[in-house]
């Protein structure tokens, strides 16, 4: 969490950003909040990116003002216009690319004063893994698949019964480049699994950590997955 304060002149206002990660090829949100003003026409929001000459986005007098917008962001940004009045300056970013990573500044002017805060934005690819029993294999085998990761993640297997066990000798992980030649499909196979046990396939890179669990009993199979972004620090 980064909290910034205003500089000289008018009073300073508090601006808060949250470091976040964008999944390439999808929408991203750059989070920024500020002390609200009662008049929308008095609020100016500017988003800037380190190393980029033009603005990422500007919103003033109740509407977008894109005359200074850098070409790399044209048609790809929007604020949540109906939420600006309550202090939400977050930016929606279309079709996140690897090159969108970097340091952004959320700069706010209101009738109360000015303020800004920086935000570190990471980009990559992350997806939920799915763990299934591989019935084609000769022995009891689990297959963990996740369609899109970048950079290349690590894959670790764990089990509820054999806590702390190292499964690297009985697992095999492969990374297959997807058609766009950036992200990769992750496939990990775990051999010699036992019944009545819960196994977890954990996939992690510097952006996200995802876990796929599977519980195999004589009568049923239960699955659960979850994904967590690793760098959501507020400023």
């Amino acid at each position: 969490l980064i909290i910034g304060f205003g500089i000289s002149g008018r009073h300073s206002i508090t601006v808060t950003t949250v470091a976040s990660a964008g999944n390439i090829g999808e929408d991203g949100i750059l989070s920024c909040t500020f002390e609200p003003d009662i008049k929308l026409s008095d609020i100016v929001i500017q988003w800037l990116k380190e190393g980029v000459l033009g603005l990422v986005h500007e919103f003033k007098e109740g509407k977008d003002e894109l005359s200074e917008q850098d070409e790399m962001f044209r048609g790809r940004t929007a604020v949540f216009a109906d939420q600006v009045i309550v202090g939400n300056a977050s930016l929606r970013l279309k079709n996140v690319q690897l090159t969108d990573a970097g340091t952004y500044k959320c700069y706010i002017i209101t009738s109360k004063g000015k303020g800004n805060a920086n935000l570190e934005y990471k980009t990559g690819a992350f997806s939920m893994p799915e763990v299934n029993v591989d019935y084609n294999a000769s022995s009891e085998t689990l297959r963990c698949e996740a369609p899109r990761w970048f950079p290349q993640p690590t894959v670790v297997w764990a089990s509820q019964v054999d806590q702390g066990a190292n499964f690297s000798e009985v697992s095999n992980t492969s990374f297959e480049l997807n058609s766009e030649n950036v992200t990769m499909k992750v496939v990990s196979v775990l051999y010699n699994v036992t019944i009545n046990n819960t196994y977890s396939c954990m996939i992690e890179n510097d952006i996200a950590k995802a876990t796929g669990d599977i519980k195999v009993t004589e009568s049923e199979i239960k699955r659960r997955s979850h994904l967590q972004l690793l760098n959501s620090k507020a400023s």
Epitope: G25, G75, A78, A81, K94, N95, V182
Partner: antibody, heavy 121, light 107 residues
Framework: EVQLVQSGAEVKKPGASVKVSCKAS????????IGWVRQAPGQGLEWIGD????????NYNEKFKGRATLTADTSTSTAYLELSSLRSEDTAVYYC??????????????WGQGTLVTVSS | DIQMTQSPSSLSASVGDRVTITCKAS??????VAWYQQKPGKAPKLLIH???TLQPGVPSRFSGSGSGTDYTLTISSLQPEDFATYYC?????????FGQGTKVEIK
């Protein structure tokens, strides 16, 4: 309610130009991209290009570059498509459509009724 | 430029049938695929955007899915008013592109 009302049907000779208008109401005209799409008789949809009236920024399908010109008049909330050097293959219904997402170029969510342009000698 | 290859170009189905239409992008990955329904003499109507987000007022029998370069529109139980032509649209890049269309006819 978002409304896009287009100009009436046109008949043009090969080599001539046509200018189709699209009057917007029910939203802030300068805050949303407007796209243009055409459909030849019995054929599919073909994207021509789009314009952001708040700054005049445009994107064009390579096929129409140099022949199609997109403009917008913010005082009347009207977008225009001008197509020059017309040929018989340009006979089609031309649609304007608002792009969802304001300054973010989204999918086309509201459409005009279409304008039939016939090119015939 | 990204091309969208839509299949089939036409299909015959009965009321109550499950119908699936696919679109394949020539390159790249993004979730910016929309689906439109068009009836003769009418403007297209947006059904789904961002791969799977249903437009307000669109019946829940319509659904979208896909990832990578392959995207699907599914009508779970075809109704009489669903007989129309359907188009996919790729809108993630600078240049937008429609699929060639799929005409859904009565068997």
């Amino acid at each position: 309610e978002v409304q896009l009302v287009q100009s009436g049907a046109e008949v043009k000779k090969p080599g001539a130009s046509v200018k189709v208008s699209c009057k917007a109401s029910g939203y802030t005209f300068t805050s949303y991209w407007i796209g243009w799409v055409r459909q030849a008789p019995g054929q599919g949809l073909e994207w021509i290009g789009d314009i952001y009236p708040g700054g005049g920024y445009t994107n064009y399908n390579e096929k129409f570059k140099g022949r199609a010109t997109l403009t917008a008049d913010t005082s009347t909330s009207t977008a225009y498509l001008e197509l020059s050097s017309l040929r018989s293959e340009d006979t089609a219904v031309y649609y304007c459509a608002r792009l969802d997402g304001s300054s973010y170029r989204g999918a086309m969510d509201s459409w005009g009724q279409g304008t039939l342009v016939t090119v015939s000698s | 430029d990204i091309q969208m290859t839509q299949s089939p170009s036409s299909l015959s189905a009965s009321v109550g049938d499950r119908v699936t239409i696919t679109c394949k992008a020539s390159q790249g990955f993004n979730k910016y695929v929309a689906w439109y329904q068009q009836k003769p003499g009418k403007a297209p109507k947006l059904l789904i955007h961002y791969t799977s987000t249903l437009q307000p007022g669109v019946p829940s029998r319509f659904s979208g899915s896909g990832s990578g370069t392959d995207y699907t529109l599914t009508i779970s139980s075809l109704q009489p008013e669903d007989f129309a032509t359907y188009y996919c649209l790729q809108y993630g890049n600078l240049l937008y592109a429609f699929g060639q269309g799929t005409k859904v006819e009565i068997k």
